[in-house]
Interface confidence: low
């Protein structure tokens, strides 16, 4: 059951001091902003008991798990039904408190009645201020039954409800005819969905035998323990002044739980705290009585004494509810009342026992809800106890329920039931949501609805490029925070999946469904401009460009150069794949062509603005290469070149160009024009002695033609260093074109 308690402070001398507090012991209760836990709600329910309107009540939240209602100005504000709602999802639970006016004509002998299906319920309204009129009984605000005023028995009006069924549950009231509804006696009837001691669909399962006034929940078989008791079967008393499923809450004020009414989830209802009784929970239990409403009797044996909060306190050598068990009888020690495991895990469960004779391994066994008995695989024997360890086979959902550890020796036997909750690891029902995207990152909300059980302890986000077979990248994130996936590729689809885990071994759920998230690719905004270009041949063009300087990283992957040949209607595109490049050599162009040239930055598949265009005219293609080039040294500074004219000339040659280079030298070559195109020999002068030279030549008509073969020749020795090579008869106007 959900750990939810509604406390009413019944010190009623001053309504302004009256308050209601709802306390949740659930993990993450009331966090509201957290997607895993809705907030606690505490309100007056005016649907059945309507009171005159007054100033609004004040709601104050104290931390994440407590909410208090104050601001009652007059006694009539208090009369009626109040409810607290807490817990998440399927565990969302409503706890109800019914408040009666102490000055009413009729008062309930007992406000909350919890009965089993098929039982007879008897509601008893005690006459407080007599009126000689009929009494009207109502159920959930609707007329139900009338009793004549003289039908009172022993100053009480009784309503008998035979063979009650769950739909009979609700708020009942007894009111004198024509009296104010605020003077009514209000009751709450809770009808369990099963007969006594049974629970579950079809009521086929047996309740664990709740102790100390605990009530077996008809849906899950758990004991809803009275305030001040804990354990699977409510077998353990809390310290005085404590309440909550684990005794974790403390009653406020110096007088402990005096004057407080405690309301718990159905089918428990409401009662005083342990050790107190009376309509305002201000009377201590009479000797020999203990527990909530002092309903329990101690009946202590063997010298035990009765404590009104916890029951029998046994002398040494004895234990048990009534101190009826000798310590010679074996006893299960410190068994947790509730254990939680994840589905399909194989946990180890320990069970410790003491006694005389001492329990050994074979004397301790573990029984599952289906009756299967497990024997321990190992035992640790210590001076004061034996701890048996059980290896549990792979858990299935049907293993949820009450398990039992049993010890048997010749001194007797003991058993302890405990609840095992098998939890289903959470599986996302939806894919994560994309919040924002950039070219290299995605911001994702990992919060999704899920099947299975919470709470969610970790969220893993798995991602990899779409259609990739590479390993998934994984990031572990906080369930409540958005996640940024970084260092991604621009304009790339990523498959993204969520994996949820709950606490404990084997708490990782299956991966959720994938979703496709695509990184962005911002459009490049910078416009380059062409710095310059020069022709490196009839079909080669070197181009250079610049970009404006802007702060921040450059948004771009490279440049696209476009050459438009308007005559032929053709476009040539050249991709420069480095965004740092500022120059490119374009080859394989058509000689003699007029091109329009521009450059633009690109990012992924997006193009930025093009530069202002440039117009470039490539020279036409030249004649074929001269044939049979030959070199012959004439002296230490002269070499003669001879050749034959090219064949199939498209027109008259305007000149020849000779290229001279020192063999193995690192310097640039020299170009010398031969302006008499009819000649087939020339002498290159001004060379260095004993030096090896390389020569080649080409003809020019409108444009330069193809190079001839390269020839080698060395000058003769013993000469002086020359100033540089010149052509035979034109040394004064040699044409050097570098």
């Amino acid at each position: 059951a959900v750990d939810l308690t509604l406390l009413a402070n019944l010190r009623l001398t001053d309504p302004q001091r009256f308050f209601l507090t709802c306390v949740s012991g659930e993990a993450g209760a009331g966090r509201g902003s957290d997607a895993w836990g809705p907030p606690l709600l505490l309100e007056k329910d005016d649907r059945i008991v309507r009171t005159p309107p007054g100033p609004p009540l004040r709601l104050a939240r104290n931390g994440s798990h407590q909410v208090t209602l104050r601001g009652f100005s007059k006694p009539s504000d208090l009369v009626g039904v109040f409810s607290c709602v807490g817990g998440a999802g399927a565990r969302r639970t409503r706890v109800i408190y019914v408040h009666n006016s102490p000055g009413a004509h009729l008062l309930p002998d007992k406000v909350t009645h919890t009965v089993n299906k098929g039982d007879t319920a008897v509601l008893s309204a005690r006459v407080h201020k007599e009126k000689q009129t009929d009494v009207i009984w109502k159920s959930n605000g609707s007329y139900f039954y009338t009793l004549d005023w003289h039908e009172a028995q022993d100053g009480r009006f009784l309503l008998q409800l035979p063979n009650v069924q769950p739909p009979s549950s609700g708020i009942y009231s007894a009111t004198y005819l024509e009296a104010s509804p605020l003077g009514s006696a209000f009751f709450r009837l809770i009808v369990r969905g099963c007969g006594a001691g049974r629970w579950g669909p079809g009521c086929t399962k047996e309740c664990p035998g709740c102790l100390h006034g605990g009530v077996c929940h008809d849906h899950d078989g758990e004991c809803v323990c009275p305030p001040g008791f804990t354990g699977t079967r409510c077998e353990q008393a809390c310290r005085e002044g404590r309440f909550g499923q684990s005794c974790q809450e403390q009653c406020p004020g110096i007088s402990g739980c005096r004057g407080l009414t405690f309301c718990l989830p159905d089918p428990y209802g409401c009662s005083c705290g342990s050790g107190w009784r009376g309509s305002q929970c201000q009377e201590a239990c009479a000797p020999g009585h203990f527990g909530a409403d002092c309903r329990l009797q101690c009946q202590c044996q063997n010298g035990g004494t009765c404590d009104r909060f916890s029951g029998c306190v046994c002398p040494s050598g004895w234990h048990g509810v009534h101190c009826e068990k000798s310590d010679r009888i074996p006893q299960i020690l410190n068994m947790a009342s509730e254990l939680e495991f994840n589905l399909e895990t194989m946990p180890r469960i320990n069970c410790a026992a003491a006694g005389n004779p001492f329990p050994v391994r074979g004397s301790i066994e573990l029984r599952k809800p289906d009756g299967t008995v497990l024997l321990s695989t190992k035992a640790i024997v210590e001076p004061e106890k034996t701890t048996a360890e059980f290896e549990v086979p792979r858990l299935v959902l049907a293993d949820s329920g009450f398990w039992e550890c049993r010890v048997s020796t010749s001194g007797g036997q003991d058993s302890r039931r405990f609840k095992v909750n098998v939890k289903v690891p959470p599986v996302p029902l939806a894919a994560p949501r994309l919040l924002t995207k950039q070219s290299r990152q995605l911001v994702v909300s990992p919060l999704v609805s899920f099947s299975g059980d919470g709470p969610i302890s970790t969220v893993r986000l798995h991602y990899r490029p779409q259609d990739s077979t590479m390993d998934w990248s994984t990031i572990v994130v906080d369930p409540s925070e958005n996640v940024t996936l970084m260092n991604l590729r621009p304009k790339t689809g990523y498959s993204v999946r969520v994996q949820l885990s709950r606490p404990g071994e084997g708490g990782e759920g299956a991966w959720g469904p994938p979703t496709l998230m695509t990184t962005d690719c911002p459009e490049p905004l910078l416009q380059p401009w062409l710095e310059g270009w020069h022709v490196e041949g009839t079909d080669r063009l070197r181009v250079s460009w610049s970009l404006p300087l802007v702060p921040g990283p450059l948004v771009g992957d490279g440049f696209l150069l476009r050459l438009w040949d308007g005559t032929r209607g053709q476009e040539r595109r050249e991709n420069v794949s480095s965004p740092q490049a500022r120059t490119a050599l374009l080859t394989g162009l058509t000689p003699g062509t007029h091109y329009q040239l521009d450059v633009q930055l690109y990012h992924c598949t997006l193009l930025g603005p093009a530069s202002p265009p440039a117009h470039v005219l490539l020279p036409p293609s030249g004649p074929p290469a001269p044939r049979h080039l030959h070199a012959q040294a004439l002296s230490d500074s002269e070499i003669q070149l001879t050749w034959k004219h090219p064949e199939a000339l498209p027109g008259p040659i305007s000149k020849y160009v000779v290229e001279v280079q020192v063999a193995g030298g690192a310097g640039d070559p020299l170009w010398i024009d031969v302006d008499r195109p009819e000649e087939t020999s020339t002498i290159i002068r001004g060379l260095n002695a004993s030096t090896r030279y390389l020569f080649r030549m080409r003809a020019s008509i409108q444009g330069l033609g193809d190079w001839s073969n390269t020839v080698e020749e060395s000058t003769l020795g013993n000469g002086l260093q020359a100033e540089g090579p010149v052509q035979e008869s034109r040394a004064a106007e040699e044409g050097l074109d570098q």
């Epitope: 289903v424 029902l429 894919a431 099947s451 299975g452 994938p514």
Partner: antibody, heavy 119, light 107 residues
């Protein structure tokens, strides 16, 4: 191609049993919530049962609760429906269907298999 | 359990007509509703989920609207291939009940 293919239908006598199978292909079966839906001849659609990815969580329509069992074998990419104590009113075409990840809507359906309960 | 009621149970229409089918839920289901199309001898086909979101590959002439307890499927220009039976289904927790269907026939 994403596909679901049911099999195992046929004629059975009242009180008898039948096991339907649904073979999944073209998607990661172990990540999806799966359902059985049926349609009596000439009638509308009736949801029968659901099973969550790990196989640990199931739910049934009241009309089949206690008689039908849904299960799955993720290693075989197969969904099952074990039908016991069959009645004449169970006669229908049985479809298996996949649930969209972000809603409970059924986005992929099999072609269906006919179950006839008659003496 | 949530009951789903569809209206009309059948209707006759011509190609090009605008057709509206209404579905009511017995309690508030916010926008947890789907629409399916089924042709004889074939399995149903998902058209719309979350009351108004078109399933991928479904023509844009199909649209859904509504929230709470009343929902509408509209076909804004009936095509020959649209003559079929249409079902609504609530998605607001189990059991996921369907409406009884609306048969759209050729006039």
């Amino acid at each position: 191609e994403v596909q679901l293919l049911e099999s195992g239908g046929g004629l059975v006598q009242p009180g008898g049993s039948l096991r339907l199978s649904c073979a999944a292909s073209g998607f990661t079966f172990s990540n999806y919530v799966m359902q059985w839906v049926r349609q009596a001849p000439g009638k509308g659609l009736e949801w029968v049962s659901v099973i969550y990815p790990s196989g640990g969580m199931t739910n049934y329509a009241d009309s089949v609760k206690g008689r039908f069992t849904i299960s799955r074998d993720n290693s075989k990419n197969t969904l099952y429906l074990q039908m016991n104590s069959l009645r004449a009113e169970d006669t229908a075409t049985y479809y298996c269907a996949r649930i969209r990840g972000d809603t409970r809507a059924f986005d992929i359906w099999g072609q269906g298999t006919m179950v006839t309960v008659s003496s | 359990d949530i009951q789903m009621t569809q209206s009309p149970s059948s209707l006759s229409a011509s190609v090009g007509d605008r057709v509206t089918i209404t579905c009511w839920a017995s309690q508030d289901i916010r926008t947890s509703l789907a629409w399916y199309q089924q042709k004889p001898g074939k399995p149903p086909k998902l058209l719309i989920f979350a009351a108004s979101t078109l399933q991928g590959g479904v023509p844009s002439r199909f649209s859904g609207s509504g929230s709470g307890t009343e929902f509408t499927l509209t076909i804004s220009g009936l095509q020959p291939e649209d003559f079929a039976t249409y079902y609504c289904q609530h998605l607001n927790g189990y059991p996921l009940t369907f409406g009884d269907g609306t048969k759209v026939e050729i006039r």
